[in-house]
């Protein structure tokens, strides 16, 4: 049964504007089941890091250590795929960052970087100093191992030199591989030492290995590459977020719920209201009334702008996010104080937050 | 791995209700949405409605709204449809689906006949 | 509400053949599309989500793209066990509706 009643009737699901919310493309983990798992939160000057799976709070427990701003998962299992995120509580911000956890039978860790093309990686050589092949910029080789979802676009690198210029060819799991190998080919830039498969699929995992000869020798460097599959997920809300604020009467403040979301998502702001001088109605649920919802007439659901204040419009603040496939909320509290009594910060605004495609 | 377990066929009288059971198990009942799909004798597939069991929310297909009441029983992970003034073309396989469509209950047939 | 338009609503091919469904909504609905599969006295399956996204298990020959109105669904080397109904569903807003199907079956 619901667990509020609503003030205001509102369809759970309306029309939506035409906009997509979508999970920017985080760092996967891959681990095999029974494999330990160690991550760290890759966020600068963190005074107090906190964890959440699945927009849900992390604790410690028997198989989930929390140290610093290191995560380890002993003994992983299926249950422990999902997106991770650490946020860095600093004393004037916070800041988070996501991660997959993908516990799988296939062994990859990591996720492509797209980087920008740049014909530095193409030495000339002085044409009197015969050379080996040799690698000019093995940064950007560190990481072997690429876990990417399906329908995502790989890049791999193995930026060389060498005189006289060395060629390039690419191998599968140790054989030649060939345009008809992979529905839609493949790309490879000579000039930026690159092969390039766009829409991947499961039949895309394997080893692939860059050779890299001239008549003076060969290198060779091998990657590989796992193709994670997707299932739907129900919105996902970033951690802290809304955050508490405080202002005087007759001040503004703003609360931000940022969403991240594959599916259409529908974001509704709700508070606790009295109806006949009650909180509660006959069914002993609280009265909620949604301020806000996304919607054709509504602008930047994601935020709720409250103006010039009352001390009525102190309590707490729900951001409830639902998709086809399910809900997440998150709540913060607006402290409102008598005019003379100023806090340390009269307006605290967060920042619209940024779409993510 | 999710499974929707759903109750038995039914033969009901036009003007009689009907009451469909599906059971979960497997994965977080309260976490997903529950839809509701029913489909015809060599018809399509037509979206009834759905439920969210952590707080009881309810979406209905217009034209099914006063007519289908959907439920959840949270201690028994079980979501129930009920469908009442059951008419001769209501006779359908209604399914219960979660929330991203990813799971499927395996189908109770309703026949509706005088 | 928002109609879904499949076409074809019927396909004869060969096992070994490429086939592309579309289906098209009456509005935008971005990239808010999934395909089931269905054969006879079974429960749908699921193929794809929010247009292009291959539900886990669902073999690599199966594809889909598509934005705004216009999705299609490809099997890029029909095999036997692809022989079926196949359904678009815009999950877009309520109520969330269904194409047609299509009914693709063994030439």
């Known amino acids: 049964r619901p667990s509020f009643s609503l003030v205001e009737d509102t369809t759970l699901e309306p029309e939506e504007p035409p906009t997509k919310y979508q999970i920017s493309q985080p760092e996967v983990y891959v681990a095999a089941p029974g494999e330990s798992l160690e991550v760290r939160c890759l966020l600068k000057d963190a005074a107090v890091i906190s964890w959440t799976k699945d927009g849900v709070h992390l604790g410690p427990n028997n198989r989930t250590v929390l140290i610093g701003e290191y995560l380890q998962i002993k003994g992983a299992t299926p249950r422990d795929s999902g997106l991770y995120a650490c946020t860095a509580s600093r004393t004037v911000d916070s800041e988070t960052w996501y991660f997959m956890v993908n516990v799988t039978d296939a062994i990859s860790s990591g996720d492509d970087e797209d980087d920008t093309d740049g014909a530095e990686d193409f030495v000339s050589e002085n044409s009197n100093n015969k050379r080996a092949p040799y690698w000019t910029n093995t940064e950007k080789m560190e990481k072997r191992l690429h876990a990417v979802p399906a329908a995502n676009t790989v890049k791999f690198r193995c930026p060389a030199g060498g005189n006289p210029m060395p060629t390039m060819r690419w191998l599968k799991n140790g054989k030649e591989f060939k345009q008809e190998h992979r529905i839609g080919g493949y790309k490879v830039r000579n000039q930026h030492w690159s092969l390039i498969m766009e829409s991947v699929v499961p039949s895309d995992k394997g080893n692939y290995t860059c050779v890299v000869e001239n008549e003076y020798g060969s290198i060779n460097h091998t990657y590989h590459l796992d193709v994670v599959e997707r299932s739907p997920h129900r919105p996902i809300l970033q951690a802290g977020l809304p955050a508490n604020a405080s202002t005087v009467v007759g001040g503004d403040v703003e609360f931000v719920c940022k969403v991240y979301s594959d599916a259409q998502p529908h974001i509704q702001w709700i508070k606790h209201v009295e109806k006949n001088g009650s909180k509660y109605g006959p069914d002993g649920l609280p009265y909620l009334k949604v301020l806000k919802h996304s919607g054709i007439n509504s602008s930047n659901a994601e935020v709720l702008a409250l103006f010039n204040v009352t001390e009525a419009d102190a309590g707490e603040y729900i951001c409830k996010v639902s998709n086809y496939i399910g809900q997440a909320n998150q709540s913060a509290w607006l402290t409102v104080l008598p005019k003379q009594q100023a806090p340390g910060r009269e307006k605290e605004i967060t920042a619209s937050p940024d779409y993510l495609e | 791995q999710a499974q929707l377990v759903q109750s038995g066929a039914e033969v009901k009288k036009p003007g009689a209700s009907v009451k469909v059971s599906c059971k979960a198990s497997?994965?977080?009942?309260?976490?997903?949405?529950m839809h509701w799909v029913r489909q015809a004798p060599g018809q399509g597939l037509e979206w009834i409605g759905l439920i969210y069991p952590g707080n009881g929310d309810t979406s209905y297909n217009q034209k099914f709204r006063g007519r289908a009441t959907l439920t959840v029983d949270t201690s028994t992970s079980t979501a129930y449809m009920e469908l009442s003034s059951l008419r001769s073309e209501d006779t359908a396989v209604y399914y219960c689906?979660?929330?991203?469509?990813?799971?499927w209950g395996q189908g109770t047939l309703v026949t509706v006949s005088s | 509400d928002i109609q879904m338009t499949q076409s074809p609503s019927s396909l004869s091919a060969s096992v070994g053949d490429r086939v592309t469904i579309t289906c098209k909504a009456s509005q935008g609905v971005t990239t808010n599309v999934a395909w089931y599969q269905q054969k006879p006295g079974k429960s749908p399956k699921l193929l794809m989500f929010?247009?292009?996204y291959r539900y886990t298990g669902v073999p690599s020959r199966f594809s889909g793209s598509g934005s705004g109105t216009d999705f299609t669904l490809t099997i890029s080397s029909l095999q036997p066990e692809d022989f079926a109904t196949y359904y678009c569903?815009?999950?877009?807003?309520?109520?969330?509706?269904f194409g047609q199907g299509t009914k693709l079956e063994i030439k």
């Open positions: 929010s247009a292009s």
């Open positions: 689906a979660r929330g991203g469509f990813d799971y």
């Open positions: 497997g994965s977080t009942f309260t976490s997903y949405n």
């Open positions: 569903q815009q999950h877009y807003s309520t109520p969330y509706t």
